[in-house]
Interface confidence: low
């Protein structure tokens, strides 16, 4: 990965020398905390013809509050710490004069990363140890001496899980809109495998390229309004908590079996990525679970390909965007990507080729955008705790933190005139700036449709007259009848529809008799159980990638290799008329219900899954007793 | 949560007896399956017998059968497994495991307690 001649690995590539511009002569007072990297930094670069000038800022939010590490100690223990003073030196930012530019950048030991001017996205790395000012390679992706990557995930397993491919309903929009929702936040588990460690040779050489790779994967993500932040990072430096294999899709089942276990114990996160410095097999260099972000199996396997950091982030942007929902581009007709050059591919592209991309295609965007409708992507939502971001608050990082009103990011990228990128405070005269139930700078008035509902176990929520924000997801009461089952925290589990889930259009519920063994481990079947929440039976259908299963009869099981965990009939499916599945049995639909709740409600709002009133338009929390105008005028007009 | 502690292991000759002990703690109420892994040097993670706490059904993998029973003590909330006519091949690092009712997988494990079977 990082050989002592590194330009022996690229085709062609210019020498410059970049020259770092003085920083403002008076500089406020920095806590202490913050470190020998300053908050800003601009540098010049002469490179193919044209002075590029590049104005960078500390990615303040690479890091969560909680971020840990976990490695092995020398003595064979497992530790892990929150290292404290957490400065880095890992910048995003963009070049004067270009208005869709980027940057990414680690200044650690000179200047690593990319920066993208138009179509052109150039890598820079330095050639010697002269530092920031010493000779630098800035090249092309496509110079840079590597094999295509192909993503592993097949069309069979995307077909069943993301719907019909047609692209009638992709509109391309302007290159430079963010999607008008809030920001979405990934929270991120990081491991990097035996193999990987040895190739990079250290804990520290490990932590610096993940956190580069990391940094280029949040600037990718930033033009979807989301943000990657990296909450634990785990090395394997002394040997594999699991079989890492050349084979992904095994690789990826051992990856998210193991995160299962470790659940209890490890960070809570949103996505768990593994690094491995094992090659796979053929031109795979990725794997991933679709659709399954804020799921148990959320995650995929990256093998570390290329030389360039920016290789395996590119990697890693396509799998998570998998585990976003989001399909390869060429399985879309019609699917539209931004690219101007000649070998253009956006990140989705099933292969990276010989040049890395760097956005995402109209149809990304728009299965993305179908996947923050689902109920399971409430995970998204949650910005890590914003009072700890390391470094403090930042204005112009999307999170809207201690002291701001609002935060578009940086001035250069902003397009919100509600707010003051300089200060996120509010532009004169806006009461907000963000929010579904915030208009033309104005909060919506009370009772306006904000968030309609999506399907039976849905409920509508609409604008409060008070807040931007609309309000929280809600759905309908847990046990409510749906089609086939009853509603349980917004969905409808159904055994056909679990089945269908995992073997694709043709799986169906097994025999009920199925449903009376349970599997212990080693494929044994015990026939001991009296209802229809143990294993998930199935028949029918293709049997998934990556999944190992039981046959007992002609009951399917869906288990790990050695047979330790199985797939288990969802909380909440139906077993039985007015019977849910609960805590592992098959229990009376009153398990959901402490007391009659739809009573305290008014009759103006009904019983949500929460077991709390949600009141129809007009009506105000907790009991939709009175009208919200009443409320607001009893209170005053705003907050 | 729930907490398991091995005890028990040790290093024994062959054909010799030892008795491992696993007691959970925390959410013991939560507990739904019980069992003994082991982990051989340079081999994967092998299931060698669990239990169901409420009914005992036991499961065993073939080359214990015979030589090794699993029981349990609800009361004391610890489970047991009883080796007999332990043979070099039985070297590993045991380890005590619980799934819980609302799940499906082994969630809970114990540190392991290293078991050496000299010939």
């Known amino acids: 990965i990082a050989p002592s001649r590194p330009w022996a690995l690229m085709e062609q590539y210019e020498v410059v020398l970049p020259w770092r511009l003085p920083g403002p002569r008076v500089r406020r007072a920095l806590p202490s905390h913050l470190g020998l990297h300053p908050e800003r930094v601009s540098y010049v670069l002469g490179a193919t013809g044209h002075n590029f000038t590049l104005h960078l800022r500390k990615n303040r939010d690479l890091l969560g509050s909680g971020y840990t590490e976990t490695y092995t100690a020398a003595n064979g223990s497992e530790v892990t710490e929150q290292p404290r003073g957490q400065d880095h030196c890992f910048y995003q930012g963009h070049v004067e004069g270009y208005p869709d530019s980027a940057a990414s950048l680690s200044t650690c030991a000179g200047l690593r990363g990319f920066f993208q001017v138009g179509s052109d996205l150039h890598l820079i790395e330095p050639l010697d140890e002269g530092g920031e000012g010493g000779r630098h390679a800035v090249y092309q992706a496509e110079h840079l001496l590597q094999t295509a990557g192909t993503c592993g995930v097949s069309d069979d397993s995307l077909g069943s899980l993301l719907g019909p491919r047609t692209a009638a309903v992709f509109r391309p929009r302007p290159g430079d809109s963010l999607p008008s929702r809030e920001t979405r936040y990934v929270e991120l588990y990081v491991v990097v495998d035996n193999a990987e460690f040895q190739m990079l040779g250290s804990e520290a050489a490990v932590r610096h390229r993940v956190l580069e790779v990391v940094n280029h994967v949040d600037k990718l993500y930033q033009k979807l309004n989301f943000r990657v932040v990296l909450v634990g990072l785990e090395i394997w430096n002394s040997q594999d908590r699991f079989h890492v294999s050349p084979d992904p899709s095994v690789t990826l089942e051992n990856l998210l079996t193991w995160q299962a276990r470790q659940r209890t114990r490890r960070h809570l996160h949103d996505n768990v990525q593994l690094i491995t410095g094992v090659d796979f097999t053929g031109t795979t260099v990725g794997f991933a679970r679709v659709s399954a972000m804020c799921s148990h199996s959320s995650g995929a396997v990256n093998q570390d390909h290329s030389k360039n950091p920016v290789g395996v982030a590119c990697t890693m942007a396509h799998e998570m965007g998998h585990n976003l929902g989001m399909d390869h581009d060429e399985n879309v007709q019609g699917c539209r990507c931004q690219e101007r050059f000649e070998a253009g591919r956006c990140i989705m592209a099933g292969s990276i080729g010989s040049s890395f991309p760097r956005m995402f295609s109209d149809c990304s965007q728009a299965y993305l955008e179908s996947f923050l409708e689902r109920p399971q992507s409430v995970c998204l939502a949650n910005a890590p705790d914003l009072s700890h971001l390391v470094g403090g608050p930042v204005c112009g990082n999307l999170f809207v933190e201690r002291g701001e009103q609002c935060d578009c990011g940086p001035p250069e990228d902003c397009r919100n005139r509600c707010c003051n990128s300089t200060t996120c405070q509010l532009a004169e005269g806006a009461q907000c700036a963000h929010g579904t139930c915030c208009q033309e700078c104005k909060v919506k008035p009370a009772g306006e449709l904000c968030r309609p509902k999506k399907d039976m176990c849905d409920l509508e929520e609409f604008c409060d007259g008070r807040h931007p924000e609309c309000p929280e997801d809600a759905f309908q009461e847990n046990g409510t009848p749906c089609s086939g089952g009853y509603c349980y925290n917004g969905a409808c589990p159904t055994l056909a529809q679990q089945c269908q889930a995992f073997w694709g259009p043709g799986g169906q519920a097994a025999e009920e008799s199925c449903f009376s063994y349970d599997i212990l481990p080693g494929c044994k079947a015990s026939r001991y159980r009296a209802d229809m929440c143990g294993v998930l039976q199935c028949k029918g259908g293709q049997q998934p990638l990556g999944r190992a299963i039981c046959i007992v009869d002609v009951c399917h099981a869906l288990t790990t290799e050695d047979g330790t965990a199985y797939e288990p009939v969802p909380e909440g499916t139906r077993c039985g008329p007015e019977k849910v599945c609960w805590k592992g049995r098959c229990q009376d639909l009153h398990v959901y219900r402490s007391s009659n709740c739809s009573a305290q409600c008014h009759n103006h709002g009904v019983c949500n899954h929460k077991q709390e009133c949600h009141c129809h338009a007009g009506w105000a929390p907790p009991h939709c007793a009175k009208l919200l105008t009443e409320v607001h005028a009893a209170s005053g007009s705003l907050p | 949560e729930v907490q398991l502690v091995e005890s028990g292991g040790g290093l024994v000759q062959a054909g010799a007896s030892l008795k491992l002990s696993c007691a959970a703690s925390?959410?013991?109420?939560?507990?739904?399956?019980m069992g003994w892994f082991r982990r051989a040097p340079g081999k994967g993670r092998e299931s060698v017998a669990t239990?169901?706490?409420?009914?005992?059904?036991?499961y065993y993998m073939d080359s214990v059968k015979g030589r090794f029973t699993i029981t349990r003590d609800n009361a004391k909330n610890t489970v047991y497994l009883q080796m007999n006519n332990l043979k070099p091949e039985d070297t590993a690092v045991y380890y005590c495991?619980?799934?819980?009712?609302?799940?499906?997988?082994?969630?809970?494990w114990g540190q392991g307690t290293q078991v050496t079977v000299s010939s």
């Open positions: 495991a619980a799934q819980t009712e609302d799940s499906a997988q082994y969630i809970y």
């Open positions: 925390g959410r013991t109420y939560d507990i739904r399956v």
């Open positions: 239990t169901t706490w409420r009914d005992n059904i036991t």
